[in-house]
């Protein structure tokens, strides 16, 4: 017999064909015997099965010896061995009807797990193969979990069953809840303004919530809350936020603070931290400054960064147009005795330059 | 290591008045929002008023607003309370919390100072 | 100014008990909601702010759930320390408030 796949929800066609190009008698029945619809003349009539409101038949290819038999909004239940009675010949097909759902809501935060679920009827032995929207594959039976989402998971699966060496694609809309970037560094010159901004990987229509940007200065020896804010249909409003610094949010998303002067003593890292209304667990930004100063005092020329620089980060001090360099993997350079002119101070990573800031020596007569 | 160490309870009849003291030690006290918070023998915690950083910004729960009043000496490394008009409701043990924890929470508490308000 | 109900007031349990007690806010507080813990004549401590974050030192059988209006701490398994009263506070408007309080006491 022949096996057809169908998904819950969905509508499926049973096909059942006459030798004869022509309208005759036929019937469907399911294992049962109970009929489901049949001809009886010219016209469609339907039996007293569950089915009946739900199956229907093209009646334009009677004529062609086509005696389909539609079912629509396929319930797991419909799974059966259907007959289809025609020229005193039995044709048997075995609808199976499979259903896979997630487990929770399809949004869900970074770092959560997703479970997906199939719903299959009994007797049935499928295996599930789905793909996410980043290439990464994961097989199961009757369910599928993903233990921790990654924003690259957002996006629709595509989900194959198997059974009988027949297929069924199911497709998944799933939308991760994270910030665009995990963490991301802001280099500034001392005095110079300070953007942060925390951009969204995903957009929802109405967008409500709260948040906190708690903050550790590296030379401070405990962390503090440099704001905190609400989020009511994507129009941010602040509720609390430091003296020092004198910080400014954005009104509208993305999110987004100013630092009217970037100073060594607010270099360090921070964590913003945003919790969306109804759903469980938080969204987390890393967000990091640098912050560079030049000095000369009397006949010592120093270049110092403040804040989190990995190890393999250079400074140097370089005379402009001239060669005297002086490179340090490390967070403070100087040279005494400095030749007058205009001196670089460089922060550079294998080559590309993050940071600069220039400082003019007058001679000393 | 942070303190907070409250003083300046004791009995007082109805009608009168007390200043209630929160020595702060241990971190940046001008750089935290403090609250006062009270709990009536065998009773619940009830958040009173608190203050910004410099003392710009002052909130009280009603039952207390136009009586008391807090304020603070960031010079000094204290927090202040001003009771005045007392009523036996006002019995109470008083607690000075700072204004520390992620999320608005109250992250350090003092032990208290107990008001007495009797006739 | 915005109510806070606890539920139950009190509750009676075990060593090695689940605990749940809830905390109703009379409007919409997004996540500004921490949980406390009072023991007899000591100050009270913070045990979760923001809803479900845990304060630094408190032991992860303690959890916090919960959005908006409705939320929940839950006491995995019951330990000898953990009879206490607890409160849930908002810090979403002012004036600030607390939960009546639910105390947990010995079976």
């Known amino acids: 017999k022949k096996v057809v796949l169908g998904k819950k929800g969905d509508t499926v066609e049973l096909t059942c064909n006459a030798s004869q190009k022509k309208n005759t008698q036929f019937h469907w029945k399911n294992s049962n015997q109970i009929k489901i619809l049949g001809i009886q003349g010219l016209f469609l009539t339907k039996g007293p099965s569950k089915l009946s409101d739900r199956a229907d038949s093209r009646k334009s290819l009677w004529d062609q010896g086509c005696f389909s038999m539609i079912i629509k909004n396929l319930k797991i239940e419909d799974s059966d061995t259907y007959i289809c009675e025609v020229e005193n010949k039995k044709e048997e097909v075995e609808l199976l009807v499979f259903g896979l759902t997630a487990n929770s809501d399809t949004h869900l935060l970074e770092g959560q797990s997703l479970t997906l679920t199939l719903e299959s009827p009994p007797g049935s032995s499928p295996s599930v193969k789905c793909r996410s929207p980043g290439g990464k594959n994961i097989q199961g039976g009757r369910t599928i979990s993903v233990p921790q989402l990654e924003r690259q998971d957002s996006g629709t699966w595509t989900c194959t069953v198997s059974q009988d060496q027949k297929t069924v694609e199911f497709k998944i809309d799933i939308v991760v809840l994270a910030f665009q970037k995990a963490s991301s560094t802001v280099y500034k010159k001392e005095g110079e303004q300070v953007e942060f901004s925390f951009p969204l990987a995903f957009t929802l229509e109405k967008l409500t919530g709260s948040g906190e940007l708690w903050w550790q200065a590296e030379r401070a020896s405990s962390s503090k809350s440099w704001i905190t804010f609400d989020l009511k249909n994507k129009e941010v409003s602040v509720k609390r936020v430091t003296q020092d610094p004198k910080l400014q949010m954005g009104k509208k998303l993305p999110l987004h603070l100013t630092l009217p002067q970037a100073l060594p003593q607010y270099a360090g890292s921070g964590n913003l931290t945003l919790a969306l209304e109804a759903k469980t667990g938080k969204l987390h930004q890393e967000v990091n400054l640098v912050v560079m100063r030049a000095t000369q005092f009397q006949e010592n020329l120093t270049c110092e960064v403040w804040g989190p620089t990995s190890p393999k980060l250079t400074l140097s001090l370089k005379l402009e147009n001239k060669g005297a360099t002086v490179s340090k993997q490390a967070k403070a350079v100087w040279v005494l005795n400095p030749e007058a002119g205009m001196w670089q101070c460089l922060l550079s990573d294998s080559g590309q330059v993050l940071l600069e800031s220039n400082i003019k020596v007058v001679p000393t007569w | 290591e942070v303190q907070l160490v409250e003083s300046g309870g004791g009995l007082v009849q109805p009608g009168g008045s007390l200043r209630l003291s929160c020595a702060a030690s241990g971190f940046t006290f001008s750089s935290y929002w403090m609250s006062w918070v009270r709990q009536a023998p065998g009773k619940g915690l009830e958040w009173v008023a608190n203050?910004?950083?410099?003392?710009?910004?002052?909130y009280y729960v009603d039952s207390v607003k136009g009586r008391f009043t807090i304020s603070r000496d960031n010079a000094k490394n204290s927090l202040y309370l001003q009771l005045n008009s007392l009523r036996a409701e006002d019995t109470a043990m008083y607690y000075c919390a700072r204004e520390g924890g992620q999320w608005l929470s109250l992250d350090y508490w003092g032990q208290g100072t107990l008001v007495t308000v009797s006739s | 100014d915005i109510q806070m109900t606890q539920s139950p007031s009190s509750v009676s349990a075990s060593v090695g008990d689940r605990v749940t007690i809830t905390c109703r806010a009379s409007q919409g507080i997004s996540s500004w909601l921490a949980w406390y813990q009072q023991k007899p004549g000591k100050a009270p401590k913070v045990l979760i702010y923001g809803v479900s974050s845990f304060q630094s030192g408190v032991p992860s059988r303690f959890s916090g759930s919960g959005s908006g209006t409705d939320f929940i701490l839950t006491i995995s398994s019951l330990q000898p320390e953990d009879f206490a009263t607890y409160y849930c506070q908002q810090a979403n408007s002012f004036p600030w408030t607390f939960g009546q309080g639910t105390k947990v006491e010995i079976k």
């Open positions: 203050i910004n950083q410099d003392g710009s910004e002052k």
